[in-house]
């Protein structure tokens, strides 16, 4: 029961996390104009990984994509790559984990196979979360560096007569979404890895013994008749055929997924 709950919760947490990573990657507010030195600006600038936007005094927002690939900063390209890798790994992890869920029966899939799949998806979620956290952190570091650089030469102008306030950028909402989402994906991955340990078949003390019959050379292994014997890896007396019967673990109702806001 605890294993199913841990695995199910890990899946849901990872699902929310990956949805958050996708949302963060698509968001335009990775960096937003710092209004501390210009709180009365009628033109508000903000930037994402894919385009930059300007909200004007009419309330109209104009966004323009970065139509160049080679002209973009290497750091921005790196952040894009990290986020995309995070999404791809997370998506594959989700796909794998769906089939690994204990509450879902697929043919005659062994618990050992489900355990391996759970571990694989868990590792994928962990790497996905780390990619997202790394991507967001690299971008945040880039912002901090640029912020203090622009603060150093904040005001430029002709003889100090006419002041031009240089636009400074600070953390946008997408960074916080990315950090939280990356963290959730990471936590979900860890939970999947923990669930994997509970899913892994318990080791038996019985060793396989070979019986040599005259004229035949057939090896009999205890636990071969899994539907009726108590031997081998089938220590929980589960029916291997899927006839609609469910064990105690599987009868439990699965908590519904709530919308993440």
């Amino acid at each position: 029961m605890a294993v199913t709950a841990c695995q199910g919760l890990g899946f849901v947490v990872s699902l929310i996390g990956i949805a958050g990573i996708i949302a963060a990657t698509c968001m335009d507010q990775w960096s937003t104009q710092d209004l501390y030195n210009n709180p009365v600006t009628a033109v508000f600038n903000y930037q994402g990984l894919w385009r930059s936007c300007v909200r004007e005094s009419s309330g109209f927002t104009e966004c323009r994509g970065y139509f160049t690939l080679l002209g973009l900063p290497a750091m921005l390209q790196a952040v894009r790559a990290l986020m995309i890798v995070g999404i791809v790994l997370g998506a594959i992890g989700l796909l794998v984990s769906i089939f690994a869920l204990k509450c879902i029966r697929i043919g005659s899939m062994e618990d050992s196979a489900k355990a391996n799949m759970t571990l694989t998806s868990g590792i994928m979620f962990i790497v996905s979360g780390l990619c997202a956290i790394a991507g967001v952190s690299v971008f945040a570091n880039m912002l901090v560096t640029n912020f203090w650089m622009s603060t150093a030469n904040m005001y430029t102008g002709m003889g100090g007569m006419v002041q031009t306030v240089q636009t400074r950028y600070t953390f946008g909402a997408a960074l916080f979404v990315g950090w939280v989402a990356g963290g959730l994906t990471l936590i979900g991955g860890v939970m999947m890895c923990i669930a994997c340990r509970g899913l892994a078949p318990e080791e038996t003390n019985y060793k396989a013994v070979s019986y040599h019959a005259s004229g035949h050379s057939v090896a009999y292994k205890p636990g071969g008749f899994k539907a009726s014997t108590g031997f081998g890896s089938n220590t929980k007396n589960k029916k291997i055929y899927d006839g609609g019967a469910r064990t105690e673990d599987e009868v439990q109702s699965y908590p519904s997924k709530h919308d993440y806001v």
Partner: antibody, heavy 115, light 113 residues
């Protein structure tokens, strides 16, 4: 096309309040902020403030912040501007303006403050 | 507040001649986010509301005759009417669209000589 229709002329006594309405049509009402600009007789244009019809958030010129109240009724696509504690120098034509670059302007509402 | 100063206050030009109106702002109106100058030009005829002519300092609004052109960047801007027509007689205003409160120049009255 953008159309902004304002309420009729008003004559008020000093100290009173006036509420001017501006009904919008021909564009997405909540997409653009509504600005209010006034023009005293023979004078230039003076920006009073704006309201975001989507959430009723306002941004006012400090000069008017204690006397101006802007409200919105999205059901009728109408914005209201109320100016209180009227003085003789508030005699002016009041315009509402919206859309990008204040492309659309109302016909103006003449408010006369006289004792 | 950004102060907008127009010159001259009034201008008399012969029909078919070039008219030039200047506008100076106390602060730069250049937005580094998109490299646009947030200066707008309006034309106002007697008894009418202002009419948008030019935005982003040099972009002509659709329907505005191409004899109207805007130029300048930062703090210094110019509105030019290449060949004055009778219907161009009006008061012209420049407006800071970059910082609150949005401010207008005092206006330039254009007349026919």
């Amino acid at each position: 096309q953008v159309q902004l229709v304002q309420s009729g002329a008003e004559v008020k006594k000093p100290g009173a309040s006036v509420k001017v309405s501006c009904k919008a049509s021909g564009y997405s009402f909540t997409t653009y902020w509504m600005h209010w600009v006034r023009q005293a007789p023979g004078q230039g244009l003076e920006w009073m403030g704006l309201i975001d019809p989507s959430d009723s958030e306002t941004r006012l010129n400090q000069k008017f912040k204690d006397r101006v109240t802007m409200t919105v009724d999205t059901s009728t696509s109408t914005v209201y501007m109320e100016l209180s504690s009227l003085r003789s120098e508030d005699t002016a034509v009041y315009y509402c303006a919206s859309n990008r670059w204040l492309l659309g302007w109302g016909q103006g509402t003449l408010v006369t403050v006289s004792s | 507040d950004i102060v907008m100063t127009q010159s001259p206050d009034s201008l008399a030009v012969s029909l078919g001649e070039r008219a030039t109106i200047n506008c100076k702002s106390s602060q730069s109106l250049l937005n580094s986010g998109n490299q646009k100058n947030y200066l707008t030009w309006y034309q106002q005829k007697p008894g009418q509301p202002p009419k948008l002519l030019i935005y982003w300092a040099s972009t002509r609004e659709s329907g505005v005759p191409d004899r109207f052109s805007g130029s300048g960047s930062g703090t210094d801007f110019t509105l030019t009417i290449s060949s004055l027509q009778a219907e161009d007689v009006a008061v012209y205003y420049c407006q800071n669209d970059y910082s609150y409160p949005l401010t207008f120049g005092q206006g330039t009255k254009l007349e026919i000589k």
